[in-house]
Interface confidence: medium
């Protein structure tokens, strides 16, 4: 009779451990219509092989609560249900899932889960994508405003997403060591909705010119959370009749030095 | 980037005076007002003056008017601030400083002056 | 000229804790108050102008408040670093006014 000799296995399924590692803090940022790869790194036991491995992964939108499947791959075939998505090949190999997403719109925003299968083991991961739109912005002079040495600015942000914007004045006399928020003849307008899903707001404020100060700076400053520091746009108050004829477009982020020199 | 370099450390006699220098850099000079502070040994700060940097325009504090003086070079972008008939309570570190931009107001690295018999 | 009374002189307390400096003006000055940090020989470094506004690069456990005469610089959780001397500054009018600062210890 045969004796059947059974090879000793050097892993057992019980020693084989399949982790998947996210975005740190579980969030990821991207600009409106930039490119993003959300990160998706698999920890495997033993050297991978792509060929009998899978990969799905899914987004959650935040308005809906449905799965949808966005990009999948197993062993000998990859889809994408999102045109343009894409996980690489090469970088799977050494255990880069991450997937990558080009163009991105305002509602590709949501919960994406990376799911990774390799028999008998499975293994997810889930990150928050938010997606931003960082305001262009612009101060004018509302030419309507006819009354002697009274001027009306506009500081216009368009374009901007998530609608939370903070828009303030500030003023710099001359001898001032630091500036002035200005709180009276500030209005700021309602927040409008764009068809793209983006948003405009627009502050006034209302000068009379000849109780200010020739050469003081006024300034708009603009905080969006798109925004790593303020946008801030100045003009100066040169005479009486100050204008701005033509709109002073701009999309300056705000300069400066370190605090104290030395 | 905006800098602004102070002239060094002074010892002086009382009745002496002191001329103490600070050149400015990475700014359109003459559009902005230098003020100066003093801090002595262990205390807190004190303004003394300031100077329209087109140099047409001081305003000085009370206490040290008669004593202090203060003038624009703007062909070298250096301010200066003299103060006359010292005595010891004058020993201090001074500072010019300019109004900054977002990140605060921009301060020299500051100059002893010590004056002492 | 505006006095700008600053207070406690000095203050212990423990990494972590929340603290409260107050500026007491003697007169009206709006919300023009500065508030500055100053470590060992350097110079003072600004923390906030307009009362309540963080200059940029500033954390967020520093913020100010108060508008008149009555100022309060708040430090919500101290780290290390924090523990050096502050001053408040008055802007309304010249002569530029200081407190007499507040030296922050640890306990």
């Known amino acids: 009779h045969h004796h059947h000799h059974h090879e000793q296995k050097l892993i057992s399924e019980e020693d084989l451990d399949l982790k998947v590692e996210m975005m740190a803090r579980g969030i990821q940022a991207t600009r409106l219509n930039d490119s993003v790869t959300i990160s998706c790194k698999v920890i495997y036991s033993q050297p991978l092989n792509i060929t009998s491995m899978g990969i799905t992964w899914f987004r959650k939108s935040l308005t809906l609560d449905k799965e949808v499947k966005v990009f999948e791959f197993f062993g000998d075939h990859q889809k994408a249900f999102r045109p343009g998505a894409n996980v690489s090949l090469w970088r799977l190999k050494s255990g880069d899932a991450s997937l990558k997403l080009p163009g991105v719109q305002l509602e590709e925003a949501g919960e994406y889960r990376c799911e990774v299968v390799v028999t008998p083991l499975k293994a997810q991961g889930t990150v928050q994508l938010k997606v931003v739109a960082s305001p262009t912005s612009r101060l004018f002079q509302d030419q309507a405003v006819v009354k002697e040495n009274e001027g009306k600015y506009m500081c216009e942000s368009s374009r901007f997403y998530p609608k939370d914007i903070n828009i303030t004045w500030e003023k710099w006399t001359q001898k001032s060591p630091h500036h002035v928020v200005i709180s009276e003849n500030v209005i700021t307008g309602p927040t409008i909705k764009n068809m793209d899903g983006t948003f405009n707001i627009t502050s006034y404020l209302k000068l009379n010119s000849s109780q200010e100060d020739p050469g003081t700076v006024y300034r708009c400053v603009i905080r969006h959370e798109s925004l790593h520091t303020p946008v801030s746009i100045d003009f100066i108050l040169t005479a009486p009749q100050q204008s701005l004829s033509e709109p002073e477009k701009t999309d300056i982020f705000s300069s400066g030095g370190g605090g104290s020199a030395g | 980037q905006v800098q602004l370099v102070q002239s060094g450390a002074e010892v002086k006699k009382p009745g002496a005076s002191v001329k103490v220098s600070c050149k400015a850099s990475?700014?359109?000079?003459?559009?902005?007002?230098m003020n100066w502070m003093r801090q002595a040994p262990g205390q807190g700060l004190e303004w003394m003056g300031g100077i329209y940097l087109s140099g047409d325009s001081t305003d000085y504090n009370e206490k040290f008017k008669g004593r202090v003086t203060m003038t624009v070079d703007t062909s070298t972008s250096t301010v200066y601030m003299e103060l006359s008939s010292l005595r010891s309570e004058d020993t201090a570190v001074y500072y010019c400083t300019r109004r900054g931009d977002y990140f605060g107001d921009f301060w020299g690295q500051g100059t002893l002056v010590t004056v002492s018999s | 000229d505006i006095q700008m009374t600053q207070s406690p002189s000095s203050l212990s307390a423990s990494v972590g804790d929340r603290v409260t400096i107050t500026c007491k003006a003697s007169?009206?000055?709006?919300?023009?108050v500065a508030w500055y940090q100053q470590k060992p020989g350097k110079a003072p470094k600004s923390l906030i102008y307009s009362a309540s506004n963080r200059y940029d690069g500033v954390p967020s456990r520093f913020s100010g408040s108060g508008s008149g005469t009555d100022f309060t610089l708040t430090i919500s959780s101290l780290q290390p670093e924090d523990f050096t001397t502050y001053y408040c500054q008055q802007y309304i009018s010249y002569p530029l006014t200081f407190g007499a600062g507040t030296k922050l210890e640890i306990k």
């Open positions: 007169q009206n000055v709006g919300k023009y």
């Open positions: 990475g700014y359109t000079f003459t559009s902005y007002w």
